[in-house]
């Protein structure tokens, strides 16, 4: 049961990570304009995202503008866009692989194949987490570098936006969930208790093993 619990926890974490990643990529809050010093009353805040930028007036009114030309965009923004989309697609692929190998599905009957699929999905989720982490960390690095660069004028200085924090959370959840899925798969390949297969097999006895019969070394 511990293996199944870890699998469920792993996939729940990766799903949360995927949703977080989607929101992070979509929200125009990667960079927030930093108006600093001289006791200025700022009438507006500028948010910049991967797809659009928004101006929020002091009245609360928000105007957003989608970036016009893909080719006119800075290369780092294009790369961040691409990595974000790839990360989300990779995570979806990981989910499909997991579903194929999950203990409660009949897509694959053989236990070893199931274990391999779950392990593969875990690795795919970890890759997705790393892909999510790259644009987020790259953008954060650029923001911090410019913020403390004495050559950069204030209008060009930015602060870390909420999307970056969501991105870090997404990456962490995908890495953690993927890691858990990898851990649920024993190195030997024999995947835990057989009673998970019982409901799909007419000849299988409807008797489950006692707890002492589990190969506990696989659940450390």
């Amino acid at each position: 049961m511990a293996s199944a619990g870890m699998q469920i926890l792993g996939v729940v974490l990766t799903l949360l990570g995927w949703v977080n990643g989607l929101v992070s990529c979509a929200l125009p809050m990667w960079k927030v304009t930093a108006f600093i010093g001289n006791s200025i009353v700022v009438a507006q805040v500028v948010w910049e995202g991967l797809w659009m930028s928004c101006v929020v007036q002091s009245t609360g009114q928000m105007q957003c503008k989608v970036y016009d030309s893909l080719l006119a965009l800075p290369q780092d923004l294009q790369a961040a866009r691409a990595l974000c989309v790839i990360a989300l697609l990779v995570a979806l692929f990981g989910l499909l692989v997991y579903l194929a190998g999950a203990k409660c599905t009949t897509c694959v009957e053989e236990k070893d194949s199931k274990a391999r699929l779950v392990l593969t999905s875990g690795i795919v989720f970890v890759i997705s987490g790393v892909l999510t982490l790259i644009p987020v960390c790259w953008t954060a690095h650029a923001i911090i570098r410019d913020f403390y660069n004495p050559l950069v004028a204030e209008a060009q200085k930015r602060e870390l936006g909420a999307s970056l924090y969501l991105g870090w959370a997404a990456s962490g959840l995908l890495l953690l969930g993927g890691g858990l899925l990898c851990c649920t798969c024993p190195s030997g390949g024999s995947q835990g208790p057989s009673h998970y297969m019982a409901r799909y097999s007419t000849s299988a006895p409807a008797i489950s093993r006692g707890p002492s019969e589990y190969p506990t070394k696989n659940y450390v």
């Epitope: 200025i40 004495p150 050559l151 950069v152 004028a153 204030e154 209008a155």
Partner: antibody, heavy 120, light 107 residues
């Protein structure tokens, strides 16, 4: 007292390059970023770019990007500005000017200027 | 780029009279404005930063005001040594840009 001593006047042919130096003294070199501003005869001032002497990071005016290179020799407390592919409209007085590292981007002290004449 | 427009181009004022120079930015520069004085044959000298803050050693007859896009340099009582070209410079946004200059002369 603070001094920004620039190299002498230069006459160059179109297409050539010029390298102007700015030797500083009287203050801690790394506490100020060094910038270059030019002034064509009878014209206004035009910022070209600047350098952080601590790490060599540069920031250029897009107008000069690719043609201007600003460098520093920290040990000699000297800044350099090289402008390539010179044309007649580059004839100007080139000033080095410093900006306090932890301050805002205005120039609190200027060099005496170097006249660069581009003529065939 | 932020354009800085100075007016007038030149100004002739009697000794002891007030001289007013205007500087208009193409967008809000949030008081990130400096004023420089360049006397004939000399290098620019910083007079005012932050739109209103007088630099050390600058006579109190010089003052700066304004906000948003519009800024003003005032010489309350013009002296002979104030004959110069005055430049405004915004440092809100890169590239740093200067106004076209205002030449102040004695009438």
């Amino acid at each position: 007292q603070v001094q920004l001593v620039q190299s002498g006047a230069e006459v160059k042919k179109p297409g050539a390059s010029v390298k102007v130096s700015c030797k500083t003294s009287g203050y801690t070199f790394t506490e100020y970023t060094m910038h270059w501003v030019r002034q064509a005869p009878g014209q206004s001032l035009e910022w070209m770019g600047g350098i952080d002497p601590n790490n060599g990071n540069t920031h250029y005016n897009q107008k000069f990007q690719g043609r201007v290179t600003i460098t520093v020799d920290k040990s000699a407390s000297t800044a350099y500005m090289e402008l390539s592919s010179l044309r007649s409209e580059d004839t100007a007085v080139y000033y080095c000017a410093r900006i306090y590292y932890f301050g805002r981007l205005y120039f609190d002290f200027w060099g005496a200027g170097t006249l660069v004449t581009v003529s065939s | 780029d932020i354009q800085m427009t100075q007016s007038p181009d030149s100004l002739a004022v009697s000794l002891g009279e007030r001289a007013t120079i205007n500087c208009k930015a193409s967008e809000d520069i949030y008081n990130r404005l400096a004023w420089y004085q360049q006397k004939p044959g000399q290098v620019p000298k910083l007079l005012i930063s932050g739109a209103t803050s007088l630099e050390t050693g600058v006579p109190s007859r010089f003052s700066g005001s304004g906000s948003g896009k519009d800024y003003t340099l005032t010489i309350s009582s013009l002296q002979a040594e104030d004959v110069a070209v005055y430049y405004c410079q915004q440092y809100w946004s890169s590239p740093l840009t200067f106004g076209g200059g205002t030449k102040v002369e004695i009438k």
